[in-house]
Interface confidence: low
């Protein structure tokens, strides 16, 4: 017989199976081209002195064998004897140290078995009910499929599972979805129905992430605010790597973690825009106002869980920067001013009340006046900063008010409302005797007081009633005595009490008689 | 391989409307958004519009709106984009681009000429 | 609806090192696209993401992005990559797209 033909002859061994465990297993036979067909098998046992006979039967009962030599693999082609439109049964007879041991047959019809590919191209990964769902173009001429597929995690060997079988151009499987790890996935198909048809090779790897995205663990440090207002919001720890399976390290397509920076800006709420949200990679820079900040994780499945900071305003002040005028059509603030087409927001709140009562006015964009000054007006009957009480006062500048990360802070800096001149009147001077010709006058501290850097000084007033001589006595606003000296005996004295601002001189307390007794010898 | 056909070029009238066509090939047709891009002799790229070819849904740039349809036929594989009310400022390439999931245009179909003129 | 400005015009020396940028508020949240465009024809990508590079791009182009610019830097730049260059990204407000007006670039020598 011819090496390429299949030999219509008896073998050149005897016909007895041994029926030991070990022998030829696993047969797979198929069409690997239009014309040409191979079978291969597995073979368990000692492989030295082994000779491998592909045997293969007719419908019509004739039988024929292929010699395969010592190799576990054979091609053939149409002409080779073999029926490939017909079914025939083949089978592996293995002749070993004077024994035959033979495989499982396998019955098929040749040109029909087709050597099927893994899943190829796209495989698109959705979530479905708490469960996976690959979706795949069938390969081209190969609609009828069994399907399995092997996943793995991080920590855990392979796992096989199975799809079912398939007969569309679209196939799709079910598998299971975890919780908190990421899983790779292969998928590998065969023909559906064919005896003996061989397992394709693996699918590329799908790599899947867990259900849930890792909620990120990442601290926040907040810079000093710098000179221009602004102050840089930079990452302590990065997010932590989601642990991935061998075949999805590196580039590992599917289980992208995706970080974002939502900003919330608290302060000034009248402006257009309150939050953003940027990639974490892109740290922004922020004014001194008061932030909410959360870091999302996302992957293809969708948001996870969040983690949010507050990061408190920058109450760092400048006393002397705002300059306030309060006429009679009302009042008017004056700043050095940033740039040309400037937006200002200018923030109050009364101090000590809960940061939710602040208001705010947003300003037209305005160039700096000929002084360089940028400058906000408000009448009386507005009621802005109407009440005689303590506002703390912020001012945010942008050149792009819509864009919350380009505002900065101008200053912050603390402002008595109202009639700030009567309501900071001090009240209950006394007056006592200090020595003989000297005195000691108190007062309770002015309303201005509560207000940092507002109270420039105290001035106490005394008159002399009877030359009407009167002297000035400027007190530094931290205290609230003063001792007069230089006094006459028997002379009437009035005093009088004021709290000054730095722009505003205050009201006169209700003037408070005394006089030093004269004292009379014995 | 991966490839995006567009219908040849037409000649239409101020007012008329056209409709350019655009088959898919050698990918998962459904997996992946198409969108509209038209070029105006020797000025820049300008985005019309997108269609998600899986379930139909769409969305129009401003400037568009009213004006665009853009449709899919799954069986064949192929996205149409029509444009109504062709004034000739609407003389330009129109292209068909895939996008992946970085919202990048990464094939492109090979454009047709779309010239208005009464 | 966001707006991304390009330089109109760039050049450089042969085998020099250019960066093309494109500037927008939408780039805050999302990296952009870089496109070249050569006359007569479509356009291609040559970097989306943060710096990926579809396969068949030579490694001379690179991507970058800070606050609100992205930046296509070619390293070495050839005769052949004097183009069009176009940047686009989605729009900060909605799931439309945007492009840049695109940036010629000018290989001398």
């Known amino acids: 017989c011819r090496t390429s033909e299949c030999c219509f002859q008896d073998p050149p061994y005897p016909d007895a199976d041994s029926g030991s465990a070990s022998g030829p297993r696993d047969l797979r036979c198929y069409r690997i081209s239009s014309d040409r067909y191979e079978c291969s098998w597995q073979y368990e046992g000692p492989t030295a002195g082994v000779s491998h006979f592909l045997r293969c039967c007719l419908s019509s009962g004739r039988c024929c064998y292929f010699a395969a030599g010592s190799a576990t693999r054979l091609q053939f082609s149409d002409q080779a004897g073999v029926s490939v439109l017909y079914t025939v049964t083949l089978w592996v007879e293995s002749w070993a140290r004077n024994q035959t041991e033979k495989s499982p047959e396998v019955t098929l019809q040749l040109y029909n078995s087709v050597k099927y590919e893994p899943p190829l191209g796209d495989i698109k990964v959705s979530k479905l009910a708490g469960q996976l769902r690959m979706e795949w173009e069938t390969p081209d001429n190969q609609v009828g499929a069994e399907v399995q597929f092997r996943h793995r995690t991080p920590s855990s060997p392979w796992k096989l599972g199975d799809c079912g079988p398939q007969d569309d151009d679209t196939e799709s499987c079910l598998c299971p979805l975890e919780m908190n790890v990421a899983q790779e996935f292969q998928l590998r198909r065969r023909q559906l129905g064919s005896q003996g048809s061989s397992w394709s090779k693996w699918s590329s790897p799908v790599c899947v992430p867990p259900e849930n995205p890792p909620q990120p663990q990442v601290r926040f440090s907040v810079e000093q605010l710098g000179q221009d207002g602004r102050r840089r919001l930079t990452l302590k720890e990065q997010p932590t790597q989601l642990e991935l399976p061998e075949g999805c390290q590196g580039l590992a397509p599917g289980t992208e973690v995706t970080y974002r920076l939502q900003l919330h800006m608290l302060s000034c709420p009248c402006k257009a825009k309150a939050t953003r949200t940027l990639h974490l990679g892109k740290m922004p820079y922020l004014s001194g106002a008061a932030y909410n900040v959360a870091v999302i994780s996302s992957n293809q499945f969708g948001p996870g869980l969040n983690q949010t900071w507050h990061i408190p305003a920058d109450t760092h002040t400048e006393p002397v920067a705002l300059n306030i005028s309060v006429g009679t059509n009302g009042t008017t603030m004056y700043w050095p001013a940033r740039a040309q087409s400037m937006t200002y927001c200018i923030e109050w709140q009364p101090v000590g009340q809960d940061g939710g009562l602040a208001t705010c006015s947003l300003t037209a964009p305005q160039d700096p006046d000929p002084a360089g000054m940028a400058t906000y007006s408000w009448s009386r009957e507005s009621g802005a900063m109407g009440q005689e009480k303590c506002y703390y006062i912020t001012i945010f500048a942008s050149a792009h008010p819509e864009k919350l990360t380009l505002w900065s802070t101008v200053l912050s800096t603390y402002h008595f409302g109202g009639n700030a001149s009567a309501a900071g009147t001090p009240h209950h001077v006394s007056v006592k005797n200090h020595s003989l010709d000297s005195v000691s006058v108190d007062w309770a501290p002015s309303l201005l007081s509560t207000c940092p850097g507002v109270l420039k000084e105290y001035v106490v007033r005394c008159r002399d009633e009877d030359s009407k001589q009167v002297s000035e006595h400027p007190v530094q606003p931290t205290e609230t005595q003063v001792t007069l000296s230089g006094l006459r005996a028997g002379v009437a004295y009035t005093v009088q009490v004021r709290a000054d601002t730095a722009w505003l001189r205050g009201v006169w307390s209700q003037p408070q008689r005394f006089s030093i007794e004269v004292q009379v010898s014995d | 391989q991966v490839q995006l056909v567009q219908s040849g070029a037409e000649v239409k009238k101020p007012g008329a409307s056209v409709r350019v066509s655009c088959k898919a090939s050698?990918?998962?047709?459904?997996?992946?958004?198409i969108h509209w891009v038209r070029q105006a002799p020797g000025q820049g790229l300008e985005w019309m519009g997108i269609?998600?070819?899986?379930?139909?849904?769409?969305s129009y740039a401003q400037k568009f709106q009213g004006r665009v349809t853009m449709t899919r036929d799954t069986s064949t594989t192929t996205v149409y984009m029509e444009l109504s009310s062709l004034r000739s400022e609407d003389t330009a390439v129109y292209y068909c681009?895939?996008?992946?999931?970085?919202?990048?245009?990464?094939?492109w179909g090979q454009g047709t000429m779309v010239t208005v003129s009464s | 609806s966001s707006e991304l400005t390009q330089d109109p015009a760039v050049s450089v020396a042969l085998g020099q090192t250019v960066r093309i940028t494109c500037q927008g508020d939408?780039?805050?949240?999302?990296?952009a696209g870089w496109y070249q465009q050569k006359p007569g024809q479509a356009p291609v990508l040559v970097i989306y993401?943060?710096?990926n590079r579809p396969s068949g791009i030579p490694d001379r182009f690179s991507g970058s992005s800070s606050e609100d610019t992205a930046s296509l830097t070619i390293t070495g730049a050839q005769a052949e990559d004097e183009a069009d260059y176009y940047c686009?990204?989605?729009?900060?407000?909605?799931?439309?797209?945007?492009f840049g007006g695109g940036t010629k670039l000018t290989v001398l020598g």
């Open positions: 686009n990204s989605r729009d900060s407000s909605d799931n439309h797209l945007v």
């Open positions: 681009a895939k996008s992946n999931w970085a919202y990048a245009f990464d094939i």
């Open positions: 050698g990918y998962t047709f459904t997996s992946y958004y």
């Open positions: 939408s780039l805050s949240s999302y990296y």
């Open positions: 993401g943060k710096n």
């Open positions: 269609i998600n070819p899986s379930g139909g849904s769409t």
